[in-house]
Interface confidence: low
């Protein structure tokens, strides 16, 4: 009698997950009776992936009409693959008994799944940083097969150079992840700069996946201060305005001291936009000079984005002013300031 | 199921101080911007308190140094710490989730009331 | 600190009317207006953020406008579940501002 042959032909297929894999088994002789079942694995812990007999497995249909006498084809068609689906399976024939009792092994068919990565997150600082400082971005991207993957960096459009990348896990997996690590150098113009993280993997054909993450998040942006004095007007009053430019973000809030006594509190809001993504505030004050002996330091102090306040500040000269038309005047950069009679902020 | 549950409240003589919790499930509290708000009997509305993700804290004029607003990153919970308490500040306190990219608020708890009288 | 005024103080309306309140603020709040709907002994409901913007899960017979210092909240058929008191509040800069309220009642 010619012995039984369980002929896997593919030793190795490989499918885009979603898609459906077809395991191939023939037998050479349908003696003895008994079923033929596929097995994920080998050995005790082995997972039972088709029983001809019984069961329920909803994605595994086989391919040829197992309930025909001489069927000899006993190919698998399994639907959905995912990544969890990889692995080596295994078409055992068994003759029938109580229990039955496995024959014979076909060699076995590894199944590898191409999975597509996820699309790459970047994730920037847990806070801001200032100008000329190093940021760091992170990229993640999970999920891909085979491990094979290429990861770049752009700024605007150009390619990064400094950052470390990590794909887990080392050894053989059904699924990867990849991490990378960019370093970043942040100028003053990066309020609308844009990091790009890019994998290119087998399973894009060509069409690489892109994670992005705005610089704004990252960025802080300290104001400019300058006090200056407009002309005298007739009515004795002097327009002290206090010029808050170039910052970002908008959070700010700017206070007027008259020598050192807080005048007015005011919270920047619903500014226009600058082209370069900052933001420009302007604040003003009325001095009443008659209302004064002394001269009145007047302070622009500005707090912006939690940051410590900066302080400009500016001295009225009582004595200067015998109702001349003045020109104006630049602060000194110190810091305290005067209490208005009237104010407001453009 | 994204919640506040305030608790705390109670009478209290003026003078006296009161710490109210908010306690949060369903999101992270200290990725929003977190506020108080309370209500007098048959009045409206009135905003107390806020704290911002980074910590930063706003108060309204009348409790400004007998307030204060903090929250617990480990216990996902808001507090206010209520001392010098008048008989101007009994009232339903609710606590308030703002939300994530203008601070509109959007969940609200279900409030707790707060008496002050002797 | 920004005021914030409502009108009216109270409004008697009909099932099936279409009502609306108005808000004014006392400075330009641009569009970071909201309302709430708020029933006797209940918390306040997030209706509408900036200004027009439906909260998760409100109906769309609500509706609001107004940009800079004039806002407004119709509400489109009136229903015996909208009779409460509505709040509108500036969230541009703090302190934070409530309207006094606006008493929808059942005419």
């Known amino acids: 009698e010619e012995e039984l042959q369980v002929i896997q032909p593919e030793k190795s297929v490989s499918v885009a997950a979603g898609d459906s894999a077809t395991l191939n088994c023939t037998v050479s002789s349908l003696i003895p009776v008994g079923p033929i079942q596929w097995f994920r694995g080998a050995g005790p812990g082995r997972e039972l992936i088709y029983n001809l007999k019984e069961g329920h497995f909803p994605r595994v249909t086989p391919v040829s009409d197992p309930t025909k006498r001489n069927n000899m084809d006993f190919s698998i068609r399994i639907s959905n693959i995912t990544p969890a689906d990889a692995g080596t399976y295994y078409c055992v024939k068994f003759r029938k008994g109580s229990p039955d009792v496995e024959l014979k092994s076909g060699a076995g068919t590894e199944l590898s799944v191409r999975a597509k990565p996820s699309a790459p997150v970047v994730s920037g600082p847990a806070v801001r940083a200032t100008a000329e400082h190093t940021v760091s971005f992170t990229c993640e991207s999970h999920g891909f097969s085979p491990r094979d993957i290429t990861l770049k960096w752009f700024k605007n459009g150009n390619e990064l150079s400094d950052f470390q990348t990590n794909v887990d896990p080392a050894g053989k997996s059904v699924s990867y992840s990849i991490r990378s690590t960019a370093r970043v150098v942040l100028t003053r113009r990066d309020v609308h700069s844009q990091v790009i993280c890019e994998v290119a993997h087998v399973t894009l054909q060509g069409d690489p996946l892109r994670g992005t993450a705005n610089l704004s998040e990252a960025i802080r942006v300290p104001p400019f201060l300058e006090v200056t004095q407009q002309s005298m007007r007739a009515d004795n009053q002097v327009n002290v305005t206090c010029q808050v430019t170039k910052f970002y973000p908008q959070r700010l809030q700017l206070t007027w001291l008259e020598n050192g006594n807080v005048s007015r509190t005011e919270m920047a809001s619903a500014l226009p936009e600058n082209k370069d993504g900052t933001y420009n505030w302007t604040s003003w004050l009325l001095v009443n000079v008659s209302a004064h002996r002394d001269d009145v330091k007047l302070t622009c102090q500005v707090e912006h984005d939690g940051q410590p306040a900066v302080n400009k500040s500016f001295s009225v000269k009582v004595s200067a002013h015998p109702k001349e038309q003045g020109s104006n005047t630049a602060a000194e950069n110190t810091g305290t300031n005067e209490r208005n009679i009237y104010g407001g902020s453009g | 199921e994204v919640q506040l549950v305030e608790s705390g409240g109670g009478l209290v003589q003026p003078g006296g101080s009161l710490r109210l919790s908010c306690a949060a499930s369903g999101f992270t509290l200290s990725s929003y911007d977190m506020h108080w708000v309370r209500q007098a009997t048959g009045k409206g509305l009135e905003w107390v308190s806020a704290?911002?993700?980074?910590?930063?804290?706003y108060y309204t004029g009348s409790v400004k140094g007998r307030f204060t607003i903090s929250r617990e990153n480990a216990k996902n919970s808001l507090y206010l710490q209520m001392n010098s308490l008048r008989a101007a500040d009994t009232a339903v306190y609710y606590c308030?989730?703002?939300?994530?990219?203008?601070?509109?608020?959007?969940?609200w708890g279900q409030g707790t009331m707060v008496t002050v009288s002797s | 600190d920004i005021q914030m005024t409502q009108s009216p103080s109270s409004l008697s309306a009909s099932v099936g009317d279409r009502v609306t309140i108005t808000c004014r603020a006392s400075q330009d709040i641009n569009n970071y207006l909201a309302w709430f709907q708020q029933k006797p002994g209940k918390a306040p409901k997030s209706l509408i953020y900036?200004?027009?913007s439906l909260h998760s899960g409100v109906p769309s017979k609500f509706s609001g406008s107004g940009s800079g210092t004039d806002f407004t909240l119709t509400i489109s058929s009136l229903q015996p579940e909208d009779f409460a008191t509505y709040y509108c509040?500036?969230?541009?800069?703090?302190?934070?501002?409530f309207g006094q309220g606006t008493k929808l009642e059942i005419k």
């Open positions: 509040q500036q969230y541009v800069s703090y302190p934070y501002t």
């Open positions: 704290i911002g993700t980074a910590g930063d804290t």
């Open positions: 900036t200004a027009s």
């Open positions: 308030v989730r703002g939300g994530v990219w203008d601070d509109a608020f959007d969940i």
